[in-house]
């Protein structure tokens, strides 16, 4: 798996002339690092059947790292996949022709030398063109841990096609109890997708009390189906030394 | 080994609708392709029009989708186009095409002329 | 929507090197696919996946792909390359294919 140099490097060189290496000196050892991070943003692909998936991981290290890719976490060869897959080197690249169905899942770029190692994680969803159910990118929204009185933000990346209607919910408590008579469990409308809600993939919390830790919920919907992925919220107070006065207000489900 | 051919009128009157079928043959409709249309005014470039899925999914140049319909049918092993409202500015040669991320079989390619 | 750029034409005699490029945003991350159309004949795809050769191909056509620019490269030209060569993506952020808008090799001579 030895890599030629990246052609996504530049050439330029900002070393001085006392640093740049002769014939019996060896380079300065650089652990692996990204050199294009902008073209990694998009994480989750979601590619109709029949197209290429190409994933990129442009790097640069020295010695000149190698690269390999996993599957779900684990080692992913050619024979994994009907049509196999190719690996460019000179761009740091993995293909996949003709994406069916058991493609879906995550694919790791590991770029690696003796001096370290980085890795990138993509989500890759085959669907049908036509209107199907929302798909949310995965690991999103993440759990927080802050501290009393911060600002959280939470992000739901949603995939969908016909448009969705994104709700952020929150699992509350109503006398005592966090299940209904329903069967269903109490939450709380804390924000949803509308003429009055701008950028409906995120959740902003200003100045967290300790009541605002709990669950909270990424609900998308279409006429199709649904999806929803959660995280927690975990506010921390200070030491006692330094704990402020702070009275909070209960919630209620709307 | 599978081949496509284009077939339907050469002359559509101005305003009415173009409709062309492909037949393929020598392979099935329903393997993991895209079934395409593409097509060339003369004397110009090619313009990718739309293309169907063998379930039925579908996807259109946006600058057509209003006017375009690609249907499969899968009894018949064959897919067809209708723009409707043509002009004089719709007068190409069409072809259709099995893709997957690229076109790898093109039909011969049929003239269609828009003039009353 | 997506916007290939290719040059209308270029010009090169024969046994030289021909270049034709296709410029996009970030083109570099997409699959770019390479097709020769000869006058009144159906296209017939030469490069896929930005430096694949389908079966048939003669290894004189080559193609790269980075950054905003791809790059077809037929070496040791011959009169029987004198065509129109056209670069196509599927756009994975429109979900639409685009084309370039074609470039003519001639060959001089």
């Known amino acids: 798996d030895a890599l030629p140099s990246s052609e996504d490097d530049d050439d330029d060189d900002d070393s001085s002339s006392e640093e740049k290496e002769t014939d019996n000196t060896k380079p300065n050892p650089v652990a692996p690092y990204w050199t294009s991070p902008e073209k990694m943003e998009k994480k989750l692909h979601a590619v109709p059947a029949a197209k290429t998936v190409k994933f990129k991981c442009p790097s640069s290290g020295t010695p000149n790292p190698t690269l390999r890719w996993l599957k779900n976490g684990k080692e992913f060869k050619p024979d994994h996949r009907i049509g196999g897959y190719k690996v460019r080197y000179a761009t740091w690249s993995i293909i996949m022709d003709s994406v069916v169905p058991s493609d879906k899942g995550n694919y790791t770029c590991i770029v690696e030398n003796e001096y370290g190692s980085i890795n990138h994680t993509y989500q890759l969803d085959v669907v049908e063109r036509s209107p199907h159910r929302p798909i949310l990118q995965a690991g999103l929204p993440a759990n927080k841990t802050v501290a009393l009185g911060s600002n959280v933000e939470f992000m739901c990346k949603v995939y969908s096609d016909p448009q969705p209607h994104i709700q952020w919910l929150k699992h509350i408590e109503v006398n005592g109890s966090k299940i209904g008579p329903d069967n269903l469990p109490y939450v709380q409308i804390l924000k949803h997708s509308g003429i009055n809600s701008s950028d409906a993939e995120v959740l902003t919390l200003f100045n967290v009390t300790e009541a605002q830790s709990g669950e909270y919920v990424c609900k998308v919907s279409n006429y199709i189906g649904e999806a929803n992925q959660s995280a927690w919220l975990t506010v921390t107070r200070p030491a006692l030394e330094e704990r402020p006065a702070v009275m909070t207000s209960p919630l209620y489900l709307e | 080994q599978v081949q496509l051919q284009e077939s339907g009128p050469g002359l559509v009157k101005p305003s009415g609708t173009l409709s062309l079928t492909c037949a393929v043959s020598?392979?099935?409709?329903?393997?993991?392709?895209?079934w395409s249309w593409v097509r060339q005014p003369p004397g110009k470039g090619l313009e990718w029009i739309g293309e169907?899925?063998?379930?039925?999914?579908?996807s259109y140049n946006p600058s057509l989708k209003s006017r375009v319909t690609i249907s499969v049918d899968k009894s018949k092993n064959q897919f067809s186009l209708k723009l409707s409202s043509v002009t004089a500015a719709d007068t190409a040669v069409y072809y259709c095409?099995?893709?997957?991320?690229?076109?790898?079989?093109w039909g011969q390619g049929t003239l269609v002329t828009v003039s009353s | 929507s997506y916007v290939l750029t290719q040059p209308p034409s270029v010009s090169v005699a024969p046994g030289q090197t021909a270049r034709i490029t296709c410029g996009g945003n970030n083109i570099g991350s997409e699959s770019v696919h390479w097709y020769q159309q000869k006058p009144g004949q159906a296209p017939v795809l030469v490069v896929y996946?930005?430096?694949d050769r389908p079966s048939g191909i003669p290894e004189r056509f080559s193609g790269s792909n980075s950054g905003n620019t791809a790059t077809l490269t037929i070496s040791r030209v011959e009169a029987g390359d004198e065509a129109d060569y056209y670069c196509q993506v599927w756009d994975s952020t429109s979900d639409h294919r685009v084309f370039g808008g074609g470039t003519k090799l001639t060959v001089l001579g």
């Open positions: 169907i899925y063998h379930s039925g999914s579908t």
């Open positions: 095409a099995r893709a997957t991320d690229w076109f790898d079989l």
């Open positions: 996946d930005d430096s």
């Open positions: 020598g392979g099935s409709i329903s393997s993991n392709n895209w």
